[in-house]
């Protein structure tokens, strides 16, 4: 004969646990139903009646099967330097992230505590390491034969175009200018962009000083103060 299915509430066998989506009520000493996500326990179970669940009120939520007497409050509205990437619903909390072009300069358990604009590399400097959700852009001077003529948090240094005859040689912030109608080979058809920040955890690294134009002018050095950040300008 098939084993009889117990309906909640029921007394568990000695030494056994309640089933999935059930909890043991200490007062009733019975296995009782949990409430589904988006609900909470309005009335706890007794020996003869199961848990009575009710929907979460506006601006409150439960994300898991539960038997909490009250739903959790959704977080405050996103700060003005953040955007809402997940709305508050009955089943999930609001999630705020730094707005595009910004990164999380200080993370806390509840989310991002402080957002800051991504550093922009000035002309003559390109992105050496792109920004992420939790780390700033790192800039580097354009090496000989490459240039960047933009103030950007995404543009890298691009190769100078190759000319049959050079009218004006290229430098770190300007492409070469050719005298002929067209260069023999253009190495730089257009600006090269790095992808926008992706979600990665920042490590406790010590980047070398790189010039930048952003508000975030921070570099960890092994010893003492840094030299002037050449070519660093405002936005």
């Amino acid at each position: 004969l098939p084993a009889q299915v117990a309906f909640t509430p029921y007394a568990p066998e000695p030494g056994s646990t309640c089933r999935l989506r059930e909890y043991y009520d200490q007062t009733a000493q019975m296995c009782c139903s949990k409430c589904s996500p988006g609900q909470h326990a309005k009335v706890f179970c007794t020996k003869t009646s199961d848990t009575v669940c009710d929907s979460c009120e506006d601006s409150t939520y439960t994300q898991l099967w539960n038997w909490v007497p009250e739903c959790l409050s959704c977080g405050s509205r996103c700060s003005s330097d953040q955007v809402e990437t997940q709305a508050c619903t009955r089943e999930q909390n609001r999630i705020c992230t730094c707005r595009p072009g910004w990164y999380c300069a200080l993370s806390k358990q509840e989310g991002c505590r402080l957002c800051a604009p991504l550093r922009k590399c000035r002309p003559g400097f390109g992105v050496a390491r792109p920004g992420t959700e939790t780390s700033d852009v790192v800039c580097k001077p354009c090496a000989p034969g490459t240039f960047s003529n933009t103030t950007s948090s995404t543009d890298i240094c691009r190769p100078h175009q190759i000319c049959n005859v050079v009218a004006i040689p290229g430098n770190a912030s300007m492409d070469a200018v050719c005298t002929s109608t067209s260069p023999t080979r253009s190495m730089a058809p257009g600006a090269v962009h790095l992808p926008q920040p992706v979600s990665t955890r920042s490590q406790h690294t010590q980047p070398t000083p790189e010039p930048s134009t952003a508000p975030s002018t921070s570099f960890l050095l092994p010893m003492g103060p840094s030299p002037p950040a050449e070519g660093s300008t405002g936005d």
Partner: antibody, heavy 116, light 112 residues
């Protein structure tokens, strides 16, 4: 006890650079940020910037961002603030303070005088 | 940027009497984490600033209980229940909810 001790007074010519140091003791340096604030003679407090002693993330006031560099050296629990291309209106007492949620401990201040 | 407006700019008070300083922010200081990062600093003549109140109403250690902070959103108040001679100085409100951190212009407390 928590202490922030700053470097001594400086007299600089216009166009020069100055570096102010802020040595922390009495707490784990890398678990807090450091802010830099300045106060011109007879004026109020002006926020210059903040740096994380943990990962070097930072932010500075827009009007200063092309002239200021903040650094930290975790091996000596010291924060540094360098201000370049000094002008006479940069004459001020420069303070470091601990924190980001609030600023609970302050350095004694460093007077920087810019004069030709 | 969030602008912090303090009133009054100067406050002459009698010893033993209460004093009140108001601070208004140009936008809400409630962070998405639920905290309001509004602090009050005291600066006595010739000294560095000193933290009195943080997160609107929490008194920092060692601060006398005659100092209290209140408010929410954009309107905040620092109260001194009975002014003492050592309270003379300039009081600043400051927000650290978001960059750039900003200070009020300060309120000078002086004895009548």
């Amino acid at each position: 006890q928590v202490q922030l001790v700053q470097s001594g007074a400086e007299v600089k010519k216009p166009g020069a650079s100055v570096t102010v140091s802020c040595k922390a003791s009495g707490y784990t340096f890398s678990t807090y940020g450091i802010i830099w604030v300045r106060q011109a003679p007879g004026q109020g407090l002006e926020w210059m910037g903040w740096i994380s002693a943990f990962n070097s993330n930072a932010n500075s006031a827009q009007k200063l961002q092309d002239r200021v560099t903040m650094t930290t050296d975790t091996s000596t629990s010291t924060a540094y603030m360098e201000l370049r291309s000094l002008r006479s209106d940069d004459t001020a007492v420069y303070y470091c303070a601990r924190g980001e949620d609030f600023f609970d401990y302050w350095g004694q201040g460093t007077l920087v005088t810019v004069s030709s | 940027d969030i602008v912090m407006t303090q009133t009054p700019l100067s406050s002459p008070v009698t010893l033993g009497q209460p004093a009140s300083i108001s601070c208004r922010s140009s936008q809400s200081l409630v962070h998405s984490d639920g905290n309001t990062y509004l602090s009050w600093l005291q600066q006595r003549p010739g000294q560095p600033p000193r933290l009195l109140i943080y997160k609107v109403s929490s008194r920092f250690s060692g601060v006398p209980d005659r100092f209290s902070g209140s408010g929410a959103g954009t309107d905040f108040t620092l109260k001194i229940s009975r002014v003492e001679a050592e309270d003379v100085g300039v009081y600043y409100c400051t927000q650290s909810t978001q960059f750039p951190f900003t200070f009020g212009r300060g309120t000078k407390l002086e004895i009548k």
